[in-house]
């Protein structure tokens, strides 16, 4: 339904608080380097303008699109050229090209300082002194570091952030109350950001059809009692929501997400029996809860799939009449029967089925040709099952840190051209699959593991896309969304790689390592491990383990020495010499 003023419409739908928060997120995701105060000023100006439009929708400029209004506002930033370089050229374009230009300049790895958490008393004072500014600052800092963060979900995080401070700043032991909550929000936030990044990559790099296929499979697993028509409606609406958020249309996205949650709750009976608790919650919690809801129980006595999709003489007729609808039905029927499969596996099966029909429906005897199509699924199912079994065994044997190290070596040998920080970050996250998924029973392992790996490998893909250095990474990232993980799994050692020159400076450490947290110290060691492999890609596991043991012993010894810096200098020389000898550098 058309509105005279889009900005007034969204302001009225969302309310002032959410409107301001979402505009701040949108601006911070576009102009990631701008100071907080500048963004607040821009948001206040937009909000005041929106209020004039609410009062009179016919007022000057109120009929302009949100992209036009927001883009014009962003283009008033005085330091655009100095701070952002060529992004300033976006301002010379007209909509919709200007917004596309801004989107293309979003930076997945902005050069921003790490967020350092102040002392609890300092945070509580800041919270009490100006709660509104404190919470806006949270939105700003997360949004600029995560330019694809799902905006309505960020509002939910901010609500929890506020609740944590409200409760804990009054507690007897503020730190004991607050710090675990902040750690949990940080970890959940990173996971949420990465999951949304995959959705946006799916839409932007592989198109709406790819996203819809993913959504059909996931929603069919989650709502196996729902009819295909119901699932299709949810998929269409969900696709609209995510297309908007990924496109920077955050007001529309949040508004449509609220409408979708409302629809789901009003139609629970025909969707899922698991939604009752979610639907009793307030809006932000409700939407989050629905997105995370457990799979409903499968209907009893579902018939065999073979009847409609293999044995029927009408397979090619039904396929020809409406290809995507028929494939959608196949995917829906397969997914609702297989909550034990990963979404990407279900999509591989659907792709195999599609390829078979394309070939067989043009053959002399189509039925004879596609009769054994389900047999082709077996190796596709067994491959992730075997991989997960092997890696969970390795994880259980090694523990998380050593499992991460094994993956660091594996991936550095596969793609040694990738930057060391990216290899460390991605391999650490790949290694977390063990603690996250291996504890689950067999029936839940694959959806947990392989769909999580898709999210992590997407991080590698988006970071690599910014500065491409490896044709093999580009190939695995761009050829097929659902085959990314098998593509990376299949990579062997890169025999074309010319080892890095040995640089003693890379392996020179100082006393500052002693004050780091255990996690940061692990990252230092893992950084050294990647560098070792880049210097000596043919090093055996045993050689690398031995050098890493030397390194750990070195850090441990010097961190308890009285004169730490002297110890690091003297023992460091011995360490480098022994490492060179051991690896033949």
């Amino acid at each position: 339904d058309a509105h005279k003023s889009e900005v007034a419409h969204r302001f009225k739908d969302l309310g002032e608080e959410n409107f301001k928060a979402l505009v701040l997120i949108a601006f911070a995701q576009y102009l990631q380097q701008c100071p907080f105060e500048d963004h607040v000023k821009l948001v206040n100006e937009v909000t005041e303008f929106a209020k004039t439009c609410v009062a009179d929708e016919s007022a000057e400029n109120c009929d302009k699109s949100l992209h036009t209004l927001f883009g014009d506002k962003l283009c008033t930033v005085a330091t655009l050229r100095e701070t952002y370089g060529e992004m300033a050229d976006c301002c010379a374009k007209q909509e919709p090209e200007r917004n596309e230009c801004f989107l293309q300049h979003k930076d997945d790895n902005p050069n921003l300082p790490r967020l350092v958490r102040p002392e609890v008393d300092v945070m509580c004072t800041a919270f009490h002194d100006n709660e509104e500014t404190f919470l806006k600052k949270y939105l700003y800092e997360i949004a600029r570091r995560h330019p694809y963060f799902y905006a309505p979900e960020l509002l939910f995080f901010a609500k929890r952030y506020k609740a944590a401070f409200t409760e804990c700043c009054q507690a007897a032991d503020k730190a004991a109350c607050l710090l675990p909550k902040l750690d949990e929000l940080r970890d959940e936030g990173k996971a949420s950001s990465a999951k949304q990044r995959l959705k946006c990559a799916s839409l932007q790099k592989f198109g709406e059809r790819a996203f819809k296929a993913w959504a059909v499979a996931r929603l069919s697993q989650r709502f196996p009692k729902a009819e295909f028509a119901e699932v299709s409606k949810l998929v269409t609406d969900l696709t609209k929501v995510h297309t908007e958020c990924c496109h920077g249309d955050l007001l529309e996205c949040a508004d449509d997400r609220a409408d979708l949650a409302k629809y789901i709750c009003e139609n629970q009976d025909s969707i899922s029996s698991k939604l009752k608790e979610c639907c009793e919650k307030p809006l932000l919690e409700k939407s989050h809860c629905i997105a995370e809801v457990e799979n409903d129980e499968m209907p009893a006595d579902l018939p065999s799939l073979a009847a409609d999709f293999v044995e029927s003489k009408d397979v090619c007729k039904n396929y020809a009449e409406a290809k995507d609808v028929f494939l959608g039905m196949f995917l829906y029927e397969y997914a609702r029967r297989h909550p034990d499969y990963s979404v990407v596996l279900l999509l591989r099966l659907a792709k195999t089925y599609e390829t078979t029909l394309e070939k067989c429906c043009a053959a002399a005897d189509p039925h004879e040709c596609y009769a054994k199509v389900f047999d082709e699924f077996k190796p596709l199912v067994e491959e992730p099952q075997n991989l997960i079994k092997q890696n969970c065994e390795l994880f259980e044997q090694l523990g998380e840190y050593k499992f991460q190290n094994a993956l660091l070596v594996r991936y550095t040998k596969k793609v040694p051209q990738v930057s060391t920080p990216t290899l460390v970050e991605v391999s650490r996250n790949l290694g977390k699959v063990g603690s996250k998924c291996c504890k689950h029973p067999e029936a839940k392992r694959m959806p947990c593991a392989e769909d999580y790996l898709s999210v992590v490998l997407n991080q590698l893909c988006v970071l690599h896309e910014k500065t491409p250095v490896s044709d093999r990474v580009t190939k695995c990232c761009t050829e097929s969304l659902v085959n990314r993980r098998p593509c990376f799994s299949a990579l062997e050692v890169d025999e074309t790689y010319v080892p890095k020159e040995f640089n003693a400076e890379t392996f020179t450490f100082h006393a500052d390592i002693c004050t780091l947290s255990e996690k940061e110290r692990q990252i230092k060691k893992q950084t050294a491990l990647v560098e070792l492999v880049k210097h000596k890609p043919k090093a055996t596991k045993e050689q690398l383990k031995a050098v890493m043991d030397d390194f750990a012993a070195f850090v441990e010894k010097c961190c308890k020495a009285d004169d730490k810096e002297t110890c690091f200098a003297e023992e460091g020389k011995k360490l480098v010499a022994a490492s060179q000898a051991a690896l033949g550098l």
Epitope: G399, K402, K545, A546, D549, D550, A552, A553, K574, L575
Partner: nanobody, 124 residues
């Protein structure tokens, strides 16, 4: 299964020297820190020294620093402890152990494979 066998322990006069050896079976030897510990009657097991996998990093307890020297020969899967200027308070059963690859190297609980021990007695 890793096996560790110590040898070289005996009765020695104060001020004398001894060389303890430990032979390890199993491939993990070459990738892990090896440590020596000792336990005197009625006392807790205490840390003596350790040496990292390739040998560049060695460390000692304050009570033996300057008198004992740890070394290893990865080709022969052995770790040695050269003990000089022995004192009666060095009397104990000496154990060699294979580090678990993660924990603090001066703590017995962070070693997951142990030998049976060899008795060292220093008489005054």
């Amino acid at each position: 299964q890793v096996q560790l066998v110590e040898s070289g322990g005996e009765l020695v006069q104060a001020g004398g020297s001894l060389r303890l050896s430990c032979v390890v079976s199993g491939r993990t030897f070459r990738t892990r820190t090896m440590g020596w510990f000792r336990q005197a009657p009625g006392k807790e097991r205490e840390y003596v020294a350790h040496i990292s996998a390739n040998g560049p990093i060695t460390d000692y307890s304050d009570s033996v620093k300057g008198r004992f020297a740890i070394s290893r020969d990865n080709a022969k899967n052995t770790v040695n402890l050269q003990m000089n200027s022995l004192k009666p308070e060095d009397t104990a059963v000496y154990y060699c152990a294979l580090h678990n690859g993660i924990g603090v190297r001066t703590v017995p609980s962070q070693y997951d494979s142990w030998g049976q021990g060899t008795q060292v007695t220093v008489s005054s």
